[in-house]
Each structure stands twice: as C-alpha cells, then as structure tokens.
C-alpha cells in the first residue's frame, strides 16, 4: 500500500556552532570546546 | 469554532451520480496543511474512508473506489464536493466529511466532523 | 489494505470498572516519517464520530483523562480507566498510514 500523506517527523532548528580553543597557559595545554546555542556542551 | 455539514440527496437511483457539499467554517483551504476528506457508514455498519484533499491540490482516494469517484475543492466558498459516479443499492450510508491537517505542531487526524447526510440508493 | 481487527465487538462494562479494547493491524502501521498514524474515534448514539485518541497514545482537547492509547507495531489498546454512562457507544480504530486510510469493526460498549 502507498503511504498516506504526512509531514516528515522532524523539525529542523538552526544554531550557530562555534568551535574555539583557550590557550590556558605553558604547561596545561589548550582547552577545546563546543559551543551551541550559546551554551559550552564540549 | 470549527465546522462542517454535508448536503446532498437524500436518494438517487441506481446508475446515477451522486455529488456531495461539505461546507466548513472555523478554517480555511488555504492554510498550509490543511485538507478535508470524506467518509462513509452504510445501516449498521462500519466506517469507510472514501477521498481526501489538501490545500495544495493533492489528492488521495481510496483504490477499491478510485474509478468512481472525484474530490475537489473551492476555497473561496469553504467548500469541498465529492461526486460518486455509478450508484448502486450497496452506496446506501450515511455520508461524513471531516477535517485533517498535516504538520507536527498539527492534531493529524479526523478533529472535526460534520453530522452526516444520509444517502439511499433506490429506484 | 490495513486489516484493522477489533475486540471484544461487544463490551458490557459495570460504571466505575476499567475496560479495555484491544486492534490489531495486519501489518506494520509505522509511517516511514517515524510516527504511527492510529487513532481511536468514539461514535455515541445517533451522532457523528468524534476523536478520542491520535498517534497511539496522544489524548485529543476535551477528552477525558481517564482514555488512553497505547502500543506499538501492529498490537494497540484503548482503555477507560473507570467507565462513565455517558461512554456508551462504538469504538472504532483506525489507521491512517497508508491508502486507504481504514477502520475496525468497532466495539460497542454498553453499561451492564
């Protein structure tokens, strides 16, 4: 049987991705993060 | 508020075709997502679903009936207009239209329904 | 077509104890979107059908919290919680996944 007709079950949000590095000083190395919506998930 | 009636004969003979208004109010044919279909129950029995259009156009029938029957629509008059070609005894049923909108922020499903005509076929 | 099959086709329930309606489709009803279209309508005497239950388990506005779907594939239920008098008539499954959209036999519950 053909389907029936119904939106795709997803909704597409755009954010903006920043990826940054902190240098954190000469023994610590560098800190890498994710940050999404303004928010650091990484 | 949101509704819908249906209006036709009340008995046609057999061979003849029958055409069907379902004039709605509370929404709009031209909204995105929006559609209208129709469904039938004859005495005692139950439901069938018979067509569906949406606001785009589309259309969708149900195959086992699909060569008798046209569904269109005219926005302008919120109305939607089934006709059913070649009626026999066993077309005799209560005749119902109802509302379905796509969308995930949508019910997607028969929300609202007319309160049905009731069609005899007979000669 | 979606074989939709109903039972009990006859439901005597005493006010205030649960009942249950089971449907079962005979395939999948999945929609390749990942939402199951299967919908529950309750027909009381003499009226139009109206909504009670749409994707399996989502009540509509106005309906009683004491209805709810549930299940998954091909096996579904309805239950009431504590049946009312005013619950009387048929309930219809149905699924609108595929062409054509399609219904039970309906279950008629009655207050004993």
């Known amino acids: 049987d053909a389907e029936f007709r119904h939106d795709s079950g997803y909704e597409v949000h755009h954010q903006k991705l920043v990826f940054f590095a902190e240098d954190v000083g000469s023994n610590k190395g560098a800190i890498i993060g994710l940050m999404v919506g303004g928010v650091v998930i990484a | 508020q949101v509704t819908l009636k249906e209006s036709g004969p009340a008995l046609v003979k057999p061979t003849q075709t029958l055409t069907l208004t379902c004039t709605f109010s509370?929404?709009?044919?031209?909204?995105?997502?929006?559609?209208v279909g129709w469904i039938r129950q004859p005495p005692g029995k139950a439901l069938e679903w018979l067509a569906h259009i949406w606001w785009d156009d589309d259309k969708s029938y149900n195959p086992s009936l699909k060569s008798r029957l046209t569904i269109s629509k005219d926005t302008s008059k919120n109305q939607v207009v089934l006709t059913m070609t070649n009626m026999d005894p066993v077309d005799t049923a209560t005749y119902y239209c109802a509302r379905r909108q796509l969308g995930l922020r949508s019910i997607d499903a028969m929300d609202y329904w007319g309160q049905g005509t009731t069609v005899t076929v007979s000669s | 077509d979606v074989v939709m099959t109903q039972s009990p086709l006859s439901l005597p329930v005493t006010p205030g104890e649960p009942a249950s309606i089971s449907c079962r489709s005979s395939?999948?009803?999945?929609?390749?979107?990942?939402?199951?279209?299967l919908e529950w309508y309750l027909q009381k005497p003499g009226q139009s059908p109206q909504l009670l239950i749409y994707?399996?388990?989502n009540r509509f506005s106005g309906v009683p919290d004491r209805f709810s779907g549930s299940g998954s594939g091909t096996d579904f239920t309805l239950k009431i919680s504590r049946v009312e008098a005013e619950d009387v008539g048929v309930y219809y499954c149905s699924q609108a996944s595929r062409v054509p959209l399609t219904f039970g036999q309906g279950t008629k519950l009655e207050i004993k």
């Open positions: 395939q999948s009803i999945l929609h390749s979107n990942g939402n199951t279209y």
């Open positions: 509370g929404f709009s044919l031209s909204t995105s997502g929006m559609g």
């Open positions: 994707k399996v388990s």
